[in-house]
Interface confidence: low
C-alpha cells in the first residue's frame, strides 16, 4: 500500500479539518513554548503544501516523508535556539534521528502558566467572533501542556468543547450550562492524558512486547467471546496505532485508528455484542466509544484453565514450540475469565506462570514441578485485594481530603527526596482513587483501583526521570512495569534520609490565603504538610494531625479577622513556634 506522496495520502484520508488539527497538535507537542500564531502559520503552510501534492503527487518535495516535511518546517522557526536551547541541535541531524531527537526533548512538565478560565461572556464572544481560531487555541493549549496526549482523541475533546459552547452560549444561564461541561472536559482530559502517557512509557521504556501483553489482557477482558486469533489481530493493530501516536506520527496514527474502528464495526459478531451502539456514531465519537466500551459477558461454558495449562502432559511441549504464543494464549484465557482482576495483576500472573515453566520444563519431572503453579498465584491475587480493601476502608473513614493527607504522609516518608510539588500532585491524585473506585461493586474495585494507580505512579516516574533524586524511585520505576505499584507499596520510611532543615519562610502565610478556592487552600495546606514530614520524617500521625488542625484553625481565624494581613503577621510566628514544639 505505497503512495507516491505520503502527505497527499494522509490529507485525502483524513480530510482538511482533521489534517490541520492533527498537524497543529503535532507541532504544539514538539515546540511547546512557541506562540499560537507561529504554529498556525506553520500549519497553514503545511496544509497549502499538502494541497499542491493532492493536485499533483509528482510535484517537488511531495515524495518526502512526513517526518522530513514536518521536521524541515519546525526547523524554520527563527527563535529555536533562544527558546529551546539544545533542542535546536536536532535540526543538524538527518531523519530518523532528527525526529527521535525532537521526541526526546518533549517536556512532561513544561514551564507554562496554568490556564485561567475567562468569564463566560468573554469566552462566548470569542467563540462567536472566530470559532475556528477559538478551537485551534484549545488544541494548541492542551497539546503543549500534554505532549503525549492521544491526538485523535484530542480531536474528539475539541468536538465536545465546540458542542458545549454552541449549546451553552445560546442558553438563558450560560454559566450554569457551560461551567459543569468545561469541568468535566478538563477532568476527563487530564485522565485521558495520564492514561496515554502510561501507554507511551510502556512502549518507549519496556518495548512493544510489554504493551502487547497489556493489550492482550485488557482486550481479552473486554471481549471474552472473541477468539485468541481475533484478539491478537486487534492487539497488533492497536499497538501500531499507539506506537505511531507515541512516536509523533499523528496523521498515520489517526488514519490507522479510523481503520481499526472500521474493522471492529465490520466484525462485531466475532468481537463483542457491546459494539453495536458505538458503531452507529460518527468517526471521532465511534473510536472513543469503542475504546471505552464495557466488558462483554463471559461465555457461560468456559472450561477450567487447569486442563490445558497445568494438568496436560503437553504443557512443556506447547510452551517450547512457541513460547510467546503459548503465554499469550494463557494470558488471554486467564483475562477473559477474570474481569475482576486488574490488568497489572493478570500480567504478574502470566510472568509467574512463565517463570514456573522456565524452571519446571528443565526439571526431571516437569509435570510434578508445575502441578501446583496455580497455588502460587494466591499471594499475588491477595496482595492487591487486601490493599484495595484496607485503603477503601481508610477512605470511607477519612473522606477524600484527609485520605489524600494520609497518602501524602505515607509517600513523603517513603521518598522524601522527591520535590514537594510532585509529592503533592501525585498524592492528591492517588487519593482520588477512593472516590473513583471504592463506591464500585467488589468485582470492579481492583481493576479500577490498581490500574488507576499504575497511571498515577507513571506520572511520578515520568517527572522523576526528568530530575532524578531518589534511587528508590528509579528502582521502582525502571525494574518492572507490572510491579511498579507493589514496589512503591513495599517501600518503608527512608532511614537514610537526612531531615530537611526548618525554614520559617516555608510556613509563612499571608492574607491572600483567604481568597483562594477550596482546592487551592487544600494544596497550600498539603504543601505545608509535606514540608513538615520532610522536616520531621518520624513524626507520628497524632503529632501531624495536631499541627494540621492548628493550621486550619489559624487560617480560619485570620480569614475572619478585620485586618487579615496583620493577623497572619502576628499569629503566623506563634503557629510556627507551637508546631516546632509539638514536633520536638
Amino acid at each position: 500500500d505505497t503512495h507516491k506522496s505520503e502527505v497527499a495520502h494522509r490529507f485525502k484520508d483524513l480530510g482538511e479539518e482533521h489534517f490541520k488539527g492533527l498537524v497543529l497538535v503535532a507541532f504544539s507537542q514538539y515546540l511547546q513554548q512557541c506562540p499560537f500564531e507561529e504554529h498556525v502559520k506553520l500549519v497553514n503552510e503545511v496544509t497549502e503544501f499538502a494541497k499542491t501534492c493532492v493536485a499533483d503527487e509528482s510535484a517537488e518535495n511531495c515524495d518526502k516523508s512526513l517526518h522530513t516535511l514536518f521536521g524541515d518546517k519546525l526547523c524554520t522557526v527563527a527563535t529555536l535556539r533562544e527558546t529551546y536551547g539544545e533542542m535546536a541541535d536536532c535540526c543538524a541531524k538527518q531523519e530518523p534521528e532528527r525526529n527521535e531527537c525532537f521526541l526526546q526533548h518533549k517536556d512532561d512538565n513544561p514551564n507554562l502558566p496554568p490556564l485561567v478560565r475567562p468569564e463566560v461572556d468573554v469566552m462566548c464572544t470569542a467563540f462567536h467572533d472566530n470559532e475556528a481560531t477559538f478551537l485551534k487555541k484549545y488544541l494548541y493549549e492542551v497539546a503543549r501542556r500534554h505532549p503525549y496526549f492521544y491526538a485523535p482523541e484530542l480531536l474528539f475533546f475539541a468536538a465536545r468543547y465546540k458542542a458545549a459552547f454552541a449549546e451553552c452560549c445560546q442558553a438563558a444561564d450560560k454559566a450554569a450550562c457551560l461551567l459543569p461541561k468545561l469541568d468535566e472536559l478538563r477532568d476527563e482530559g487530564k485522565a485521558s492524558s495520564a492514561k496515554q502517557r502510561l501507554k507511551c512509557a510502556s512502549l518507549q521504556k519496556f518495548g512493544d512486547r510489554a504493551f502487547k501483553a497489556w493489550a492482550v489482557a485488557r482486550l481479552s477482558q473486554k471481549f471474552p467471546k472473541a477468539e485468541f486469533a481475533e484478539v491478537s489481530k486487534l492487539v497488533t493493530d492497536l499497538t501500531k496505532v499507539h506506537t505511531e501516536c507515541c512516536h509523533g506520527d499523528l496523521l498515520e496514527c489517526a488514519d490507522d485508528r479510523a481503520d481499526l474502528a472500521k474493522y471492529m464495526c465490520e466484525n462485531q459478531d466475532s468481537i463483542s455484542s457491546k459494539l453495536k451502539e458505538c458503531c452507529d456514531k460518527p468517526l471521532l465519537e465511534k473510536s472513543h466509544c469503542l475504546a471505552e466500551v464495557e466488558n462483554d459477558e463471559m461465555p457461560a461454558d468456559l472450561p477450567s484453565l487447569a486442563a490445558d495449562y497445568v494438568e496436560s502432559k503437553d504443557v512443556c511441549k506447547n510452551y517450547a514450540e512457541a513460547k510467546d504464543v503459548f503465554l499469550g494464549m494463557f494470558l488471554y484465557e486467564y483475562a477473559r475469565r477474570h474481569p475482576d482482576y486488574s490488568v497489572m495483576l493478570l500480567l504478574r500472573l502470566a510472568k509467574a506462570y512463565e517463570a514456573t515453566l522456565e524452571k519446571c520444563c528443565a526439571a526431571a519431572d516437569p509435570h510434578e514441578c508445575y502441578a501446583k503453579v496455580f497455588d502460587e498465584f494466591q499471594p499475588l491475587v491477595e496482595e492487591p485485594q487486601n490493599l484495595v480493601k484496607q485503603n477503601c476502608e481508610l477512605f470511607e473513614q477519612l473522606g477524600e481530603y484527609k485520605f489524600q493527607n494520609a497518602l501524602l504522609v505515607r509517600y513523603t516518608k517513603k521518598v522524601p527526596q522527591v520535590s514537594t510539588p510532585t509529592l503533592v500532585e501525585v498524592s492528591r491524585n492517588l487519593g482520588k482513587v477512593g472516590a473513583k473506585c471504592c463506591k464500585l461493586p467488589e468485582a470492579k474495585r481492583m481493576p479500577c483501583a490498581e490500574d488507576y494507580l499504575s497511571v498515577v505512579l507513571n506520572r511520578l516516574c515520568v517527572l522523576h526521570e526528568k530530575t532524578p533524586v531518589s534511587e528508590k524511585v528509579t528502582k521502582c520505576c525502571t525494574e518492572s512495569l507490572v510491579n511498579r505499584r507493589p514496589c512503591f507499596s513495599a517501600l518503608e520510611l527512608d532511614e537514610a534520609y537526612v531531615p530537611k532543615a526548618f525554614n520559617a519562610e516555608t510556613f509563612t502565610f499571608h492574607a491572600d490565603m483567604c481568597t483562594l478556592s477550596e482546592k487551592e487552600k487544600q494544596v497550600k495546606k498539603q504543601t505545608a504538610l509535606v514540608e513538615l514530614v520532610k522536616h520531621k520524617p518520624k513524626a507520628t500521625k497524632e503529632q501531624l494531625k495536631g499541627v494540621m488542625d492548628n493550621f486550619a484553625a489559624f487560617v480560619e481565624k485570620c480569614c475572619k479577622a478585620d485586618d487579615k494581613e496583620a493577623c497572619f503577621a502576628e499569629e503566623g510566628p506563634k503557629f510556627v513556634a507551637a508546631s516546632q514544639a509539638a514536633l520536638a
Partner: nanobody, 124 residues
C-alpha cells in the same frame, strides 16, 4: 520499502561457526524488529531469533539458545546472526525478516519484508 539481502552462508563442519549478515536498503532499519527464520529441506519455515528495534530485547528458539546470537547495527542498516557449535540439523536456508509491528517476534506472519535467503550446510 525495505529490501533485505542475506550473506555469509556456506558449508561448515559440525561444531564450526558462521556469521550471517542481513543488509537493508531503501530505508533505515531502526523502525523494524529484525528476525531470522530458516527452512530445512522438506520442513516448514521456523523461527530462529529476533531482536527489538533498539537492540535491547532478543529472543531465540529453544533449539538455538546458547549457540546463536542475534545483533544489529542500525547505523550500518545491518542485522547479524552469529552461529556457533553448529549441528547437522542446523542445515537450512536462512531468511532475514523485518517487521514494523511484531507482536510476538516469533510468528512469521508479523514480518513485513523478507530476504531471498542464504544457504547454510553443516556436514562432515
Amino acid at each position: 520499502e525495505v529490501q533485505l539481502v542475506e550473506s555469509g552462508g556456506g558449508v561448515v563442519q559440525p561444531g564450526g561457526s558462521l556469521r550471517l549478515s542481513c543488509a537493508a536498503s531503501g530505508s533505515t532499519i531502526s523502525s523494524y524488529v529484525m528476525g531470522w527464520f530458516r527452512r530445512a529441506p522438506g520442513k516448514e519455515r521456523e523461527f530462529v531469533a529476533a531482536i527489538s528495534r533498539s537492540g535491547g530485547y532478543t529472543y531465540y528458539a529453544d533449539s538455538v539458545k546458547g549457540r546463536f546470537t542475534i545483533s544489529r547495527d542500525n547505523s550500518k542498516k545491518t542485522a547479524y546472526l552469529q552461529m556457533n557449535s553448529l549441528r547437522p540439523e542446523d542445515t537450512a536456508l536462512y531468511y532475514c525478516a523485518a517487521g514494523r509491528y511484531s507482536a510476538w517476534y516469533s510468528q512469521s506472519y508479523e514480518y513485513d519484508y523478507w530476504g531471498q535467503g542464504t544457504l547454510v550446510t553443516v556436514s562432515s
